[in-house]
Amino acid sequence: HNTTVFQGVEGQSLQVSCPYDSMKHWGRRKAWCRQLGEKGPCQRVVSTHNLWLLSFLRRRNGSTAITDDTLGGTLTITLRNLQPHDAGFYQCQSLHGSEADTLRKVLVEVLADPLDHRDAGDLWVPGESESFEDAHVEHSISRSLLEGEIPFPPTS
């Protein structure tokens, strides 16, 4: 699997999409996990509804939400109020039994807000009580990581 890079701005929302073959993965729940190290396990962050037929319903864990268009074959993950610690490698997964097939490998990059919002007193930040539906979603910038490309080039 190639890695697809999704870039979002700190404090805003980032939408990650993972397309898949809807027939190949018919009946299978999906999950979003965070890769712990290069060879480490992928730690489950959130998964779709326990009943596959209700996969279209949004499920959330903290600031991360997931929804699955099982007919169209697109899994969508929304990371709300993006923070620097959200940067890293993730996977979209298709679950069957206790096994998980990787649908897409994702690198999330968090960009500093070009406008220094932290100094603005009148900035609205979605609170924990706000729903994901209300959150403003920035269209993410995504690209595929080229083979052999270093995601975070060392600074000299």
Epitope: D21, M23, K24, W26, G27, R28, R29, L51, W52, L53, L95, H96, G97, S98, E99
Partner: antibody, heavy 123, light 107 residues
């Protein structure tokens, strides 16, 4: 009616190659995984591997990896199991089976089976 | 690999009897288990999936139960056509593995 029809019995000598087939009908062949299962004489069932004919994604049991090749030709709705060099220990009945995912528990089981192909390897 | 162990290996019973076959997994497999029936010279037939769900067309005298590591297949009232070999199979992880089989014979 869903059907998996397998090729006929084969008698081969050790070292020979062989390719057996499993033709699906009565359903969308490219939309279901197909598994191959071995049953040695008087013994139990052994899962060999699986293929998704839609894109030829294949998984093998470690016990059979490198021993056999699983392939499919979606244009003729047929899955294959092949050996490049048979051994006497390959003598067995080989079944193909359609794997169906049941959305109740997001796992998969074998709901339709072929009639089996008996392979006999003897010098 | 997950080992599946069935007991007994064979059982003799009469028409009308209630028969229970057990299957134990070497590690927890939730409810990801199937039961198949196989008659001599024939392909296996799916009876039960997800440990307790009856496959379409299978008589209601067949039932399955259990989760984790211990599972049972019960035939409430044996019919002549039920004499066959029964296999359990885990659908938890690759490679898929089957029990060694339980042969159900006429007493």
């Amino acid at each position: 009616e869903v059907q998996l029809v397998q090729s006929g019995a084969e008698v081969k000598k050790p070292g020979e190659s062989l390719k057996i087939s499993c033709k699906g009908s009565g359903y969308s062949f490219t939309s279901y995984w197909i598994a191959w299962v071995r049953q040695m004489p008087g013994k139990g069932l052994e899962w060999m591997g699986i293929i998704y004919p839609g894109d030829s994604d294949t998984r093998y049991s470690p016990s059979f990896q490198g021993q056999v090749t699983i392939s499919a030709d979606k244009s003729i709705s047929t899955a294959y199991l092949q050996w490049s060099s048979l051994k006497a220990s390959d003598t067995a009945m080989y079944f193909c089976a359609r794997q169906r995912t049941f959305y109740y528990d997001s796992s998969d089981y074998f709901d339709y089976w072929g009639q089996g192909t008996l392979v006999t390897v003897s010098s | 690999d997950i080992q599946m162990t069935q007991s007994p290996s064979s059982v003799s019973a009469s028409v009308g009897d209630r028969v229970t076959i057990t299957c134990r997994a070497s590690q927890g497999i939730s409810s990801w288990l199937a039961w198949y029936q196989q008659k001599p010279g024939k392909a296996p037939k799916l009876l039960i999936y997800a440990a307790s769900s009856l496959q379409n067309g299978v008589p209601s005298r067949f039932s399955g139960s259990g989760s984790g590591t211990d599972f049972t297949l019960t035939i409430s009232s044996l019919q002549p056509e039920d004499f066959a070999t029964y296999f359990c199979q885990q659908a938890d992880s690759f490679p898929r593995t089957f029990g060694q089989g339980t042969k159900l014979e006429i007493k």
